[in-house]
Amino acid sequence: VTGSRVYPANEVTLLDSRSVQGELGWIASPLEGGWEEVSIMDEKNTPIRTYQVCNVMEPSQNNWLRTDWITREGAQRVYIEIKFTLRDCNSLPGVMGTCKETFNLYYYESDNDKERFIRENQFVKIDTIAADESFTQVDIGDRIMKLNTEIRDVGPLSKKGFYLAFQDVGACIALVSVRVFYKKCPLTVRNLAQFPDTITGADTSSLVEVRGSCVNNSEEKDVPKMYCGADGEWLVPIGNCLCNAGHEERSGECQACKIGYYKALSTDATCAKCPPHSYSVWEGATSCTCDRGFFRADNDAASMPCTRPPSAPLNLISNVNETSVNLEWSSPQNTGGRQDISYNVVCKKCGAGDPSKCRPCGSGVHYTPQQNGLKTTKVSITDLLAHTNYTFEIWAVNGVSKYNPNPDQSVSVTVTTNQAAPSSIALVQAKEVTRYSVALAWLEPDRPNGVILEYEVKYYEKDQNERSYRIVRTAARNTDIKGLNPLTSYVFHVRARTAAGYGDFSEPLEVTTNTVPSRIIGDGANST
């Protein structure tokens, strides 16, 4: 049973005489009169088992003390630390010829852990141990004891274990502590790679190459390697591991990002606070979830703030110029936190009687510079119909507008285009022809371009060829032209007038009056 004593992390103790409770029971030769196990009290009044010999009276001493079998535990080189106190020969009266001030240290490798006798010739000498000039003063009870510490190493070892032996040749000596240990490079984490306990090499100058394994939640960047030096120190770290996404290095470990933090990639960076308008509710987030109403575009980096669609453009102004409209507006009050704002124009043609019944304007309308993706805050719309109700919507859009289920990003204006001269009348008919009159009827122009104030009928005898014509005006879409000559060819033109002026005359309608008093009723453009 051994008590706990603290030694450096790079030393693994195989034997510590100070930690043994009770007698050590090592083998002495001779059994009597040589090495003797003695219990002394240390400074804490705890008994220490020591071995002492002080056969200084007789010459040619040869007293051996052998430890129990010591397991090698895979070590190829072991270290022996001996703490001992040696009495100066000149402090002992009358022993100058026989007293010595050194002892010898031996070892013997063996697979047998129960060898009962000391066979001196089996042992290999490690060194002769002498007291140093410098010694440690250690309290043993109330007494100051001169304690020397000597360390020797031995190797390479190959058998399962070994025995140590101490040969006294006539010194007055006490072995206060014998510790046998080997050195290892202790388990360590370097550059996020864990390197296991590694026993040092057999040679005092050897380096043992060790491959590390990435700690939990990390991955190799470059193959992690280190070298275990003979003194139990790790040397020359090569390569490293990086914490996985969602993890950062803390105290040599890859720990999950805390709530409210994230890490998108396997890098050596620390977790970052969630960008504005985003959050993480779990530890180990690789990205942050956007707040309600905020979004992240496909090409937005995880580090970018979440953004939202812009609010509606402001201060929309329209300027109607006949069948053209110029629109200007101001940027939205809230751009949603993005720079990639643009504008789309939606044109709707609405009925005069019921403005809610609107239809898309269609492809005949033209937009300058363009209808969609406008980067400027103005647009010119041309080729509109005159005297028509139009609703124009200006939409502010950005990279996340498409994610918004409830758009409120547009401003609209409804305008009516100016009245223009109407288009020509497509169909003029002679409804009734007599000897002296012609009853005309026609359709409203395809594009009235305003309110038709009146129609103007121009007619003349065909032979006159417009050198002499007459004008009749009417608000109705029919009129009787009287006072005509019988059996005469007349040419009729009709045009409409709005506030903006007259439209073009219709195609000529040629009609010949009758010679007989009967009526001719026709609906063609050329009645004869």
Epitope: M41, C54, N55, M57, E58, I140, D142, R143, M145, C172
Partner: antibody
Framework: QVQLLQSGAEVKKPGASVKVPCKAS????????MSWVRQAPGQGLEWMGW????????TYAQGFTGRFVFSLDTSVSTAYLQISSLKAEDTAVYYC??????????????WGQGTLVTVSS | EIVLTQSPATLSVSPGERATLSCRAS??????LAWYQQKPGQAPRLLIY???TRATGIPDRFSASGSGTDFTLTISRVEPEDFAVYYC????????FGQGTKVEIK
Amino acid sequence: QVQLLQSGAEVKKPGASVKVPCKASGYTFTSYAMSWVRQAPGQGLEWMGWINTNTGNPTYAQGFTGRFVFSLDTSVSTAYLQISSLKAEDTAVYYCARVRFTVYGDGMDVWGQGTLVTVSS
Amino acid sequence: EIVLTQSPATLSVSPGERATLSCRASQSVSSNLAWYQQKPGQAPRLLIYGASTRATGIPDRFSASGSGTDFTLTISRVEPEDFAVYYCQQYGSSWTFGQGTKVEIK
């Protein structure tokens, strides 16, 4: 077992001599020095000196030079104390004691039973 | 010559009590001091050497301390067989004994 055996009581006249033997057994005689101690009746202990059993070299304490001689016969593992010109004040118990040197200190760890020497006319 | 003075000359204690004996040297003897017990009609017995190290077979109720000039022998719980005369002895320079302390039954 380790022991020191001394001879029985001696009665001597003043001016005579006495040789007190101390026979060692149970250990290697020459490995330990031998010390001699005197105790007068009703008095304390007085160290007389010691002898190196290996070399035969004696060391005498103050007051015990001249008439007192330490000697050895290693062949029979025996130490001797010889007192010559005995005086009445030499009346005492004389002890031999094995001297043990250790790294922690010295001491007389094995004692003979003592020999009473009485000097009386 | 180094003189050792022991005190008290006589110490009366009851069995089971603690006994403390003192020994003072006229000059420093470092730790080179021993204690002996002597019962009437018997040879002395080595108790302590090196100022504090118990000799083989000595019960652990006997303990000692000190260095230089002041030394103490303590019997933690006096047993009937402990009533005797106790001597200190120095071996720093030549060897000398103290005059002894008698521990008697109270």
